[in-house]
């Protein structure tokens, strides 16, 4: 199974002296997830032609995936570390249902999909420890997530392939924006 960052003492400088919320540890964790996403995207692109699909087809998909917007304070202009940290945690919590959907979508990369899901849960815990303004963080309703999952799994094959592609692409973009923003916190 893929090794989570920090599980191997060679992976982190002075592993025992670092708090779990340290900048380096969080950064390593995000990069680990991004590596996992790259592997999953590779399998998705090899399996279907979604990666070359037209933007029109992508725009037609009505998934409500978390996305960074100016008001979230995570971009260089209008950067706000408190607002942004809340957005990152909220967004990751919202992505969890989509990561659950991915679990049965891969054959050769099944372990990788599980590793992405598990390490995202750990990342959320790290960031929640870092966040002071926990009141502003809203957790998605379990019933809402369950019905969304059922709906996604009921789609036809083409839509499921498109959904998988969109989740991975959006999650990658979200994590890359998070990485840039967290650097200044």
């Amino acid at each position: 199974a893929p090794v989570l960052p920090g599980e191997d003492s060679k992976d982190v400088a002075a592993p025992h002296s670092q708090p779990l919320t340290s900048s380096e540890r969080i950064d390593k964790h995000i990069r680990y997830i991004l590596d996992g996403i790259s592997a999953l995207r590779k399998e998705t692109c090899n399996r279907s032609n979604m990666c070359e699909s037209s933007k029109e087809a992508l725009a037609e998909n009505n998934l409500n995936l978390p996305k960074m917007a100016e008001k979230d304070g995570c971009f260089q202009s209008g950067f706000n570390e408190d607002t942004c940290l809340v957005k990152i945690i909220t967004g990751l919590l919202e992505f969890e249902v989509y990561l659950e959907y991915l679990q049965n979508r891969f054959e050769s990369s099944e372990e990788q999909a599980r590793a992405v899901q598990m390490s995202t849960k750990v990342l959320i815990q790290f960031l929640q420890k870092k966040a002071k303004n926990l009141d502003a963080i809203t957790t998605p309703e379990p019933t809402t997530n369950a019905s969304l999952l059922t709906k996604l799994q009921a789609q036809n094959q083409w839509l499921q392939d498109m959904t998988t592609h969109l989740i991975l692409r959006s999650f990658k973009e979200f994590l890359q924006s998070s990485l840039r923003a967290l650097r200044q916190m």
């Epitope: 002296s17 708090p19 340290s22 380096e24 950064d27 202009s77 408190d82």
Partner: antibody, heavy 118, light 109 residues
Framework: EVQLLESGGGLVQPGGSLRLSCAAS????????MSWVRQAPGKGPEWVSR????????YYGDSVKGRFTISRDNSKNTLYLQMNSLRAEDTAVYYC?????WGLGDYWGQGTLVTVSS | QTVVTQEPSFSVSPGGTVTLTCGLS?????????PGWYQQTPGQAPRALIY???DRHSGVPDRFSGSISGNKAALTITGAQAEDEADYYC?????????FGGGTQLTVL
């Protein structure tokens, strides 16, 4: 053009205090974490402290922890370093620098000299 | 405490290629350490050359390049020039702090 201008250095006795300032221009100051780095005569640079973009988090090197306080005023585009209980080993040129990110490298000022001597 | 290690000195012939390294006393250097490289000539403030592993600072000649090779960060100067004779320092983010290496004195012979 990115500019960082340190001020407030000078001669101070051991046990004394000093407050350094760094005026920033040419970039979105409030979007960047900022650091103080010092360099003692004939030595290499030593990281002193960092403050997050919004000022909510501060970090210190072991040698200054409990004696120095970093702060910032984003409305004035200014970074500060309050130095208390100064020691001879704090003698150095103090530089302020932005934390690289958003496609911008880290820029350093020209520095301000702090001399701790009786 | 984790120590950032650099070669104390290095020499290179004009036009030659030299690679300076930056390691950790415990563990490997990764992109999450955001390796940075600085050049300092006598009487001058340090000048940033490379940030975030391999991003060249504005105004820095393209003969300077950064990378991570094996378990260390590296600064490569391709086609060294007389004005490259200087002290070179690397910096790594470790945990929540930044640590500088002891520096490499580069001589262009």
């Amino acid at each position: 053009e990115v500019q960082l201008l340190e001020s407030g250095g000078g001669l101070v006795q051991p046990g004394g205090s000093l407050r350094l300032s760094c005026a920033a221009s040419g970039f979105t100051f409030s979007s960047y974490a900022m650091s103080w780095v010092r360099q003692a005569p004939g030595k290499g640079p030593e990281w002193v402290s960092r403050i997050s973009a919004g000022g909510g988090s501060t970090y210190y090197g072991d040698s200054v922890k409990g004696r120095f306080t970093i702060s910032r005023d984003n409305s004035k585009n200014t970074l500060y370093l309050q130095m208390n209980s100064l020691r001879a080993e704090d003698t150095a040129v103090y530089y302020c620098a932005n934390r690289a990110g958003w496609g911008l490298g880290d820029y350093w000022g020209q520095g301000t000299l702090v001399t701790v001597s009786s | 405490q984790t120590v950032v290690t650099q070669e104390p000195s290095f020499s290179v012939s004009p036009g030659g290629t030299v690679t300076l390294t930056c390691g950790l006393s415990s563990g490997s250097v990764t992109a999450s350490n955001y390796p940075g490289w600085y050049q300092q000539t006598p009487g001058q403030a340090p000048r940033a050359l490379i940030y975030s592993t391999n991003d060249r600072h504005s105004g820095v000649p393209d003969r300077f390049s950064g990378s991570i090779s094996g378990n260390k960060a590296a600064l490569t100067i391709t086609g060294a020039q007389a004005e490259d004779e200087a002290d070179y320092y690397c910096a790594l983010d470790i945990g929540d702090i930044t640590e500088f290496g002891g520096g490499t004195q580069l001589t262009v012979l």
